[in-house]
């Protein structure tokens, strides 16, 4: 058993039929010695008396808010949560496996630049009685500070009859140098509590590996005289690290017809302009990627050929 | 990335072309190592990230763009002494383009070159003959060092009398390649910045 926060404790249980469970001793936080009784949740049934209560925690019915009283007055509370371990593996019931980039990916993180700011998100089908707490650090043995905000519900999607909820959190490394070469990964730890179930999820990454630039901005077309060709120009996204001559991007320019089956013409360039042939009803899209370290491509920025 | 590559103008900052070749060569070598050593811990998640140049050179700090010198987090151990030598400097006189930066890059390359050559000698003794260092990568390191044109003492190649542990050598190769790729990225950024200055 360990303390998650004040008056909230996590009991780690091996979860299998007829498991013996864990013996837990609760102590009433009071100078009083006599006349103390214990109850669980809203029940008025007295579970025991005395300053300490010994319980055998085997299942969710044994978890909950234990309260010690004296003469009708509440003295203190202890909330017991369960962390299930099945076949040696901690349960992951609360979050959905996003299966990208690999199986057992519960947390996904992205950074728009090298500033040390990043966003992580996760999915769940659970809509109520759910809380998240996020902590992060650079390295684990001698951790350096990363500050994370509160997790918020960022999207709701309908999947068949069920809804899926996306939560996200923004974190910022306390003293980040955009040019630094990372040798210790960022660790992100999410505590999830659904009713009386506790689970924790972790992700470890280098900022350089989760870079995904914003799409190029100010995408414009300039027709070339007496030609079907156009000059496409764009700019670096505002959120990208500066100076751009040091944090350079490379670009992919694509001409895509109306039909998805039509052949796509693609050009790769390090410049912020390109000359392409604009077909009728086609659209021109440009996306960006770090020129020197191949992490993710940005989403496409698009303009119609017409 | 297998993308069309533009050839730089001959008048361009002399080291840019070499640094681009270096990054391409080390990336290809790392990819080859990951594939060949698929049953070894050779991915970024599996290896320990060691920097053989740590406390010996200060490339990131010495080559910091001017715009980032205002960022206190980038100034932990910034060197401020300059040496003026090296053909890559050409005639440009920007305070950023300090010879210290280029000499630091040169020292990095020299250290990695020695490590890779020592390692290759061991890998050539492996009866499995599973992996060797790409000669092109070693050649590209050499070319960039020549373009940097710094004179420094030659570091003797390490020779070891004991029987090599090939498993450990291959793990070390992965660690070295990952670290060298990260340094090659920094070198490429620096050369691009110098070229634009």
């Amino acid at each position: 058993i360990w303390e998650l926060k004040k008056d909230v404790y996590v009991v780690e249980l091996d979860w299998y039929p007829d498991a013996p469970g864990e013996m837990v001793v609760l102590t009433c936080d009071t100078p009083e010695e006599d006349g103390i009784t214990w109850t669980l949740d809203q029940s008025s049934e007295v579970l025991g008396s005395g300053k300490t209560l010994t319980i055998q925690v085997k299942e969710f019915g044994d978890a909950g808010q234990y309260t010690c009283h004296k003469g009708g007055e509440v003295l203190s509370h202890s909330l017991l949560l369960l962390h299930k371990k099945e076949d040696g593996i901690w349960s992951t019931d609360i979050l959905k496996d996003q299966k990208e980039p690999k199986n057992k990916t519960f947390l996904r993180c992205e950074a728009k630049n090298y500033s040390g700011r990043f966003t992580c998100w996760w999915l769940t089908t659970i809509s109520t009685d759910l809380t998240f707490s996020v902590k992060s650090s650079r390295g684990s043995s001698d951790p350096q500070g990363v500050t994370c905000g509160a997790a918020t519900l960022s999207a709701e999607r309908v999947r068949g009859d069920n809804k899926e909820y996306e939560y996200s959190v923004e974190c910022q490394e306390d003293s980040a140098c955009p040019a630094a070469e990372e040798s210790l990964p960022i660790e992100v730890m999410v505590d999830a509590v659904h009713k009386l179930k506790y689970e924790n999820y972790t992700s470890s990454f280098f900022i350089r590996d989760i870079i995904k630039p914003d799409p190029p901005k100010n995408l414009q077309l300039k027709p070339l005289k007496n030609s079907r060709q156009v000059e496409v120009s764009w700019e670096y996204p505002d959120t990208w690290s500066t100076p751009h001559s040091y944090f350079s991007l490379t670009f992919c320019v694509q001409v895509q017809g109306k039909s998805k089956r039509e052949k796509k013409d693609r050009v790769f360039t390090d410049k912020t302009s390109a000359t392409v042939i604009c077909r009728k009803n086609a659209s021109i899209s440009v996306r960006a990627q770090d020129r020197y370290y191949s992490s993710s491509w940005s989403e496409w920025a698009s303009v119609p050929c017409s | 990335r297998n993308l069309p590559v533009a050839t730089p103008d001959p008048g361009m900052f002399p080291c840019l072309h070499h640094s681009q070749n270096l990054l391409r060569a080390v990336s290809n070598m790392l990819q080859k190592a990951r594939q060949t050593l698929e049953f070894y811990p050779c991915t970024s998640e599996e290896i320990d990230h060691e920097d053989i140049t740590k406390d010996k050179t200060s490339t990131v700090e010495a080559c910091l763009p001017l715009e980032l010198t205002k960022n206190e987090s980038c100034l932990n151990s910034r060197e401020t002494s300059f040496i003026t030598n090296g053909s890559c400097l050409a005639s440009r006189k920007t305070s950023f383009m300090m010879a210290l930066c280029l000499s630091s890059i040169y020292e990095d390359l020299k250290m990695y070159q020695v490590e890779f050559k020592t390692m290759n000698a061991k890998l050539l003794m492996d009866p499995k003959r599973q992996i060797f260092l790409d000669q092109n990568m070693l050649a590209v390191i050499d070319e960039l060092m020549q373009a940097l044109n710094f004179n420094s003492e030659t570091v003797p190649q390490k020779s070891s009398l004991e029987e090599p542990d090939f498993y450990k050598t291959k793990i070390k190769l992965c660690i070295l390649l990952h670290a060298f790729r990260i340094r090659a990225v920094t070198i490429d950024r620096v050369m691009s910045y110098l070229n634009a200055s």
């Epitope: 949740d41 809203q42 299942e59 019931d93 089908t125 809509s127 069920n162 659904h194 | -």
Partner: antibody
């Protein structure tokens, strides 16, 4: 502590109807409230809940046919455009107070809604 | 999400025992309650958290199970136990909520 439904009557299809659940002996700011219905001779079917903070959650089949709202002492169920399939006894119940998704330990007697032309 | 109750109807003698099963289509931990409903009356809570007896409910009623399999057992049957019994999952309103189809208990 009690709840009581009212407003059930005979209506023609398509005529909006609002059922009201009046509570006494407790505050709605501490409990989830649920609306459940039971067609003649059928089982219990949950329609939707309103949490202590006023958030509403509906069964997937509802699809905009009902809306739940509350005041300080009442919880309303609005039937937007009733059909004959909505003929049932409508129950309002109070949660235990432990959770939003809760079990229900205080039930009203129910109010009968008949939708017929 | 579905809660399947079996059997839909059961007949038992006074002082006998009845067992009703409730199966969830996914794990709902122990977030299951049982209700008793008599004709013309609202449901009455018997059991919550799968096995905890609601105040004032005789100990002849007991609940067990967790995950996806749950059981309500009524021992020492009385005529007054003739009613329809429903299980209810309250795991989450989106990911596991609702009532079972009901089990009619006839006491002979």
């Amino acid at each position: 502590q009690s709840v009581e439904e009212s407003g059930g009557r005979l209506v023609t299809p398509g005529t909006p109807l609002t059922l009201t659940c009046a509570v006494s002996g407790f505050s709605l700011s501490g409990y989830t409230m649920i609306w459940v219905r039971q067609a003649p001779g059928e089982g219990l079917e949950w329609i939707g809940i309103i949490s202590s903070s006023g958030n509403t959650y509906y069964a997937s089949w509802v699809k905009g046919r009902f809306t739940i709202s509350k005041t300080s002492t009442t919880v309303d169920l609005k039937m937007i455009s009733p059909t004959t399939e909505d003929t049932a006894t409508y129950f309002c119940a109070r949660g235990s107070g432990a959770y939003i998704s809760d079990y229900f330990n205080v039930w009203g007697p129910g109010t009968l809604v008949t939708v017929s032309s | 999400f579905e809660l399947t109750q079996t059997p839909s109807s059961v007949e038992a003698a006074v002082e006998g025992t009845v067992t009703i099963k409730c199966q969830a289509s996914q794990s709902i931990d122990s977030w299951l309650s049982w209700y008793q409903q008599k004709p013309g009356q609202p449901p009455k809570l018997l059991i919550y958290s799968a096995s905890k007896l609601a105040p004032g409910v005789p100990s002849r009623f007991s609940g067990s199970g967790s995950g996806t399999q749950f059981t309500l057992t009524i021992g020492d049957l009385e005529c007054a136990d003739a009613a329809t019994y429903y299980c209810q999952s309250y795991y989450d309103v989106n990911a596991g909520y609702g009532f079972g189809g009901g089990t009619e208990v006839v006491v002979v």
